[in-house]
């Protein structure tokens, strides 16, 4: 399937040029998306190009500015948040990144009714997290690991927690491992729907071992960064959930929510919290051995001012073939009766589908079914359920939005997006206004991304919000590579792949091949999305063929493929990349003496193991920030897929699956190893151990470190990195500079 056909007019050939590395590093061909900041059923806010905050009314077609760029600039604000009562806006400045999601910032409150900043009882700085209540203009914020509450922006704060302590006790914000591997947010507090209650998590990291690394900076002595970071098998954070009445916070204080007995009997995690009503809350818990999850629905007891979680409202989700859920355990979407809910989990055939749970999980009614997967439930209204799936035309790397009418019987299903812009758009997400009165569709490709606004009743397109016209014009004289997405059938396994081909690709010629791999559990690399990136340049300018392959362990194709890697990381992911390479060679246009593989993070692990597989297939390869031993990585992630590194569990495979164990096999390949010294996620330790093993085995290799850079290798390091990797590959493939 050719997704981006090259232009056919020969007269244009002379004016067309290939992509350059500079194009990629400058972000010349980056695209824009438009996500409305909904404030009602028919209104949204958007930050204009000149930085005014503008309110749009879909029904009148009118818009007006509620906050000027002058006010934004006066405090150097880069972000904003309107209070639900529309009286105040918080302005966020002095953004300072911490980990993947977390950052600190300074916050100012602007009073829209009076056109001035709120003076008196200003917020402290820097704040770790701040949010409005869902109704009115109460504020909850986290400062120095403690939670504070303001009834109004100008009021003095009420301190809710007092035990917060850096790197020890975290209130309302996650510690490192919960942020990265469980919650995937910078916050751990949740307002009830009308703002009556505030729920929050407390993480106790007192007994967690600390990872320490040097941050060189430019002082005479380097700083040491210390992070409580539980590696596989280590002591984990202890979590507790509390709820406080925000109307009378001092009355009974925070009340702890009980943990289900079957969870509390051994090490466990809290995985998410979902408010149902102001007086009903749903908590999800997970055993440390992550194949049992419990969803617990708790009710407020007015007489005792406590939260009661009856056993009859506990729903167990268990996997017998792998871990619970996909990457995370899915969260419930409650219906209007405030007790039944919709949830995605594996059906009897091993495909993730939407189920409706009214009383027990055993009696769940399956809403979707087929040899494809439901991926996300966007919204449930009185009469419709909107979700995304990869059902259409059996391409797992697509995402379309569907509507199921739940108000009628039998429920009818309609694909909202499948035929809208079929060639251009095959990978969508959506954003819904209150009651799904309107929604925005954001199409990520395979053509140039486009964002559109739609009527929630008729699905009619109302207007284009962003169509990336400038990008389209800029690409008119660029020779983009061709892309195709196809599949290989090997030993009852379907291997989907994306191939990126040089613009003048000729099947009768031979091309160097670069495999780009990630391959982590529940990931997907072969997606129908638009991208002009480094590999686009390598195909366009340097004439390489690039391939991405989704092997065993990857997502959205059923549990058989997903859970194949359970307790055996580093085996089948590598095998499947190798199998695919052999199939590509058979296609006849690959120069088998010029094959390389590269990957980042989990992909660095897979590329390292592939290079050390002893197959002789790869001439060279690159590992950026690789995991080298699962004993070095985070407990929550690693144990989900590998169990524990103990003798009576899975220690043997932990030991067998290291990169270091294969040091000897790197002798006949050119290996480039790259890592940031301040990587908080995959610690530099991983590459240090690879390097040590290679030195001890007297194996030559190349390496590059990036001082004080984290797992993302951002800023100027990005330019240096891609320039360096380009030189390495061109040398490997004997391409002239």
């Amino acid at each position: 399937i050719v997704l981006r056909p090259s232009r056919v007019h020969n007269s244009e050939e002379n004016t067309m040029r290939a992509l350059t590395l500079k194009d990629i590093l400058n972000g010349t061909f980056s695209y824009k998306t438009f996500f409305p900041n909904w404030i009602s059923g028919q209104e949204y806010l958007h930050q204009s190009a000149d930085n005014n905050i503008v309110l749009y009314n879909i029904e009148t077609g009118q818009s007006y500015t509620i906050l000027s760029n002058r006010t934004m600039k006066s405090v150097n604000a880069s972000n904003y948040g309107l209070s639900p009562d529309r009286q105040f806006v918080y302005l966020e400045s002095d953004y300072s990144k911490l980990w993947r999601y977390s950052y600190t910032a300074t916050y100012y409150i602007y009073d829209l009714s009076n056109g001035e900043f709120v003076r008196g009882n200003e917020l402290p700085r820097p704040i770790q997290y701040l949010c409005w209540s869902p109704v009115g203009s109460k504020l909850a914020y986290v400062y120095q690991n403690n939670i504070y509450l303001k009834q109004r922006p100008g009021d003095p704060p009420f301190q809710i927690t007092f035990n917060g302590r850096e790197n020890k006790i975290f209130n309302g914000i996650p510690d490192w491992v919960y942020e990265e591997e469980m919650l995937a947010t910078k916050y751990a507090l949740w307002w009830s729907p009308n703002g009556k209650f505030l729920a929050y998590a407390e993480f106790n990291d007192t007994d967690i071992p600390v990872i320490a690394y040097s941050y060189y900076g430019d002082e005479q002595y380097p700083r040491t960064i210390n992070i409580p970071y539980p590696k596989a098998g280590a002591k984990n954070p202890v979590v507790r959930i509390f709820i406080i009445d925000t109307t009378y916070p001092a009355y009974v204080g925070p009340q702890e929510v009980p943990v289900p007995a079957m969870i509390a009997s051994s090490d466990y995690y809290f995985s998410w919290l979902t408010w149902v009503t102001d007086e009903r809350v749903c908590l999800q818990w997970l055993k440390r051995v992550q194949n049992v999850s419990v969803l617990s629905i708790c009710d407020f007891r007015e007489d005792w001012q406590t939260w009661d979680c009856p056993k009859t409202q506990e729903h167990i989700e268990e996997s017998r073939t792998g871990w619970a859920g996909g990457f995370f355990v899915s969260t419930p979407v409650f219906s209007y009766d405030a007790i039944s809910y919709y949830k995605i989990f594996s059906d009897k055939d091993g495909y993730k589908h939407i189920h409706y749970i009214k009383d027990t999980v055993e009696n769940a009614i399956q809403i979707t079914s087929g040899k494809w997967e439901a991926i996300n439930i966007f919204r449930v209204t009185q009469d419709s359920l909107f979700y995304s799936s990869n059902e259409f035309e059996e391409y797992p790397g697509r995402r379309n939005i569907y509507r199921i009418s739940i108000g009628s019987y039998p429920p009818s299903k309609k694909c909202v997006t499948c035929h809208l812009r079929k060639e251009r758009c095959q990978y969508y997400t959506a954003s819904f206004s209150d009651y799904a009165k309107y929604y925005a569709l954001v199409c990520y490709g395979p053509g140039i991304p486009i964002s559109t606004l739609h009527d929630g009743r008729t699905d009619q397109e109302i207007k284009i919000l962003e169509e990336n016209k400038e990008l389209e014009n800029a690409l008119k004289n660029i020779q983009l590579p061709k892309e195709e997405i196809k599949k290989l059938e090997v030993d009852e396994i379907t291997l989907w792949y994306k191939m990126i081909l040089p613009p003048q690709f000729d099947r009768s010629k031979k091309y160097p091949l670069l495999i780009q791999v990630y391959g982590g559990p529940c990931s997907q690399s072969v997606r129908s999305v638009f991208a002009v990136n480094w590999i686009s340049y390598l195909a366009s300018k340097e004439g390489m063929v690039i391939a991405l392959v989704d092997g065993r362990g990857t997502a959205f194709q059923g549990d058989k493929l997903l859970y194949a890697v359970y307790r055996k990381l580093g085996v089948y992911e590598v095998e499947d990349q190798i199998t695919a390479v052999r199939k590509f060679i058979e296609m006849g246009f690959i120069d088998e003496k010029r094959i390389a593989i590269w990957g980042w993070s989990y992909g660095g692990y897979v590329s390292s193991l592939a290079l050390a597989s002893g197959t002789g297939l790869f001439k060279c390869g690159i590992a950026v920030a690789p995991v080298s031993s699962w004993e070095y990585y985070a407990s929550v992630y690693t144990e989900r897929f590998m169990g524990l590194p103990t003798k009576d569990d899975n220690l043997e495979h932990y030991k067998n699956s290291t990169v270091m164990a294969r040091a000897e096999y790197f002798r006949n390949v050119d290996y480039l190893l790259i890592h940031g010294t301040a990587d908080d996620n995959v610690h530099f330790q991983n590459s240090a151990q690879i390097a040590k093993a290679l030195v001890n085995a007297q194996v030559d290799f190349q390496a590059m470190w990036y001082s004080d850079q984290n797992h993302g290798l951002s800023g100027l390091s990005t330019n240096h990195l891609y320039t360096h990797m380009t030189h390495f590959l061109k040398q490997c493939f004997s391409l002239s500079d």
Epitope: T60, Y64, S68
Partner: nanobody
Framework: QVQLQESGGGLVQTGGSLRLSCAAS????????MGWYRQALGNQRELVAG???????YYPDSVKGRFTISRDNDKNTIYLQMNSLKPEDTAVYYC???????????WGQGTQVTVSS
């Protein structure tokens, strides 16, 4: 130029009622969310009620259950029914867009409400 004309204020005893009206010029009124605001002497202006084009309403806790906002789209008018009035409700009452538009110089004159004890 957009015009907003508030009326219906007056002097009332504690526990009494008043109904305020605000006539707005059509272009701004039609389909937009509107609000009633008040400003007591020496205090900041504050919202007392908001209504969106589809009739969704909002009230702060201080007036919830006592005040009711409504709109008549045909007459380009919004109303504020105020019951069980208290001395602390004494203020000048204004109507405007909700939230207000910046540089929107047409906050009206307002209408004075005085609640005596």
């Amino acid at each position: 130029q957009v015009q907003l004309q508030e009326s219906g204020g007056g002097l009332v005893q504690t526990g009494g009622s008043l109904r305020l009206s605000c006539a707005a010029s059509g272009s701004i009124f039609v389909g937009n969310a509107m609000g009633w605001y008040r400003q007591a002497l020496g205090n900041q202006r504050e919202l007392v009620a908001g209504i969106t084009s589809d009739g969704t309403t909002y009230y702060p806790d201080s007036v919830k259950g006592r005040f009711t906002i409504s709109r008549d789209n045909d007459k380009n008018t919004i109303y504020l029914q105020m019951n069980s009035l208290k001395p602390e409700d004494t203020a000048v009452y204004y109507c405007n867009l909700w939230p207000p538009r910046i540089g929107f110089a047409s906050w009206g004159q307002g209408t004075q409400v005085t609640v005596s004890s």
